[in-house]
């Protein structure tokens, strides 16, 4: 199946809130866009 980035971000924000309240953990951010250059990319849209 496919993964919707916005769904992942929504879930992440929920877990971030839970981590702060239950375990006193602070998660600043996770970047979904910081990826290496795709040297193995193929032609096509």
């Amino acid at each position: 199946g496919t993964i919707n980035v916005h769904d992942v971000e929504t879930q992440f924000n929920q877990y971030k809130t839970e981590a702060a309240s239950r375990y006193n953990l602070t998660i600043s951010d996770v970047s979904v866009s910081d990826v290496p250059f795709p040297f193995s990319a193929q032609s096509g849209a």
Partner: antibody
């Protein structure tokens, strides 16, 4: 509207340093890789450096490796190029570009700034 | 380093004519991009990943190819199409651009 505005070019002596800046607007800066491309007078385009959206992954050609440093400040929506030990052959117009790539695709340098001229001469 | 050679270096044509530009790589690449540079202007993306039209680019532009040989075609030249065209490969580092083809008015 996507805009990339370069600044910091000028005349510098061989061996000197210069820092170029590129102010980005009109898109979520941290979600895109960014690059510098240069063009010497009457010559072809030459890739100078690429940095990923979060700044973790950085690439250079051998021609500038060890002399140039690319960086970004995502809070300020600004891309930088620190150029040290400049040579006459670094004389060119330097363009800032937005890179449209992801984990398994590369859609090219889809936006370009107007360029800033760097002249290295004694 | 992959060297990209574009031919012809200069193409002299009249408006309305068909233009065929080629880009040859010294070794096989997965795809290429094409850029247009008008005199005194910054380059702009025309075709990405060999055959995909960039945003705002008219349908008279098309791209094809595979391996080490790629083609950019302009089906019917408009006055604003007279410019320099560059191919680019990003299959391996260093990323490289072609030597350029200048399309001039005959």
């Amino acid at each position: 509207e996507v805009q990339l505005v370069e600044s910091g070019g000028g005349l510098v002596k061989p061996g000197g340093s210069l820092r170029l800046s590129c102010a980005a607007s009109g898109f979520t800066f941290s979600r895109y890789g960014m690059s510098w491309v240069r063009q010497a007078p009457g010559k072809r385009l030459e890739w100078v450096s690429t940095i990923s959206g979060g700044g973790t992954y950085i690439y250079y050609p051998d021609s500038v490796k060890g002399r140039f440093t690319i960086s970004r400040d995502n809070a300020k929506n600004t891309l930088y190029l620190q150029m040290n030990s400049l040579r006459a052959e670094d004389t060119a117009v330097y363009y800032c570009t937005r890179d449209n790539y992801g984990r398994n695709y590369d859609y090219g340098m889809d936006y370009w700034g107007q360029g800033t001229l760097v002249t290295v001469s004694s | 380093e992959i060297v990209l050679t574009q031919s012809p270096a200069t193409l002299s044509l009249s408006p309305g004519e068909r233009a065929t530009l080629t880009c040859s790589a010294t070794s096989s690449v997965s795809y290429i991009h094409w850029y247009q540079q008008r005199p005194g202007q910054s380059p702009r993306l025309l075709i990405y990943s060999t055959s995909n039209l960039a945003s705002g680019i008219p349908a008279r532009f098309s791209g094809s190819g595979s391996g080490s040989d790629y083609t950019l075609t302009i089906s019917s030249l408009e006055p604003e199409d007279f410019a320099v065209y560059y191919c680019q490969q990003r299959s391996s580092s260093p990323f490289t651009f072609g030597s350029g083809t200048k399309v001039e008015i005959k």
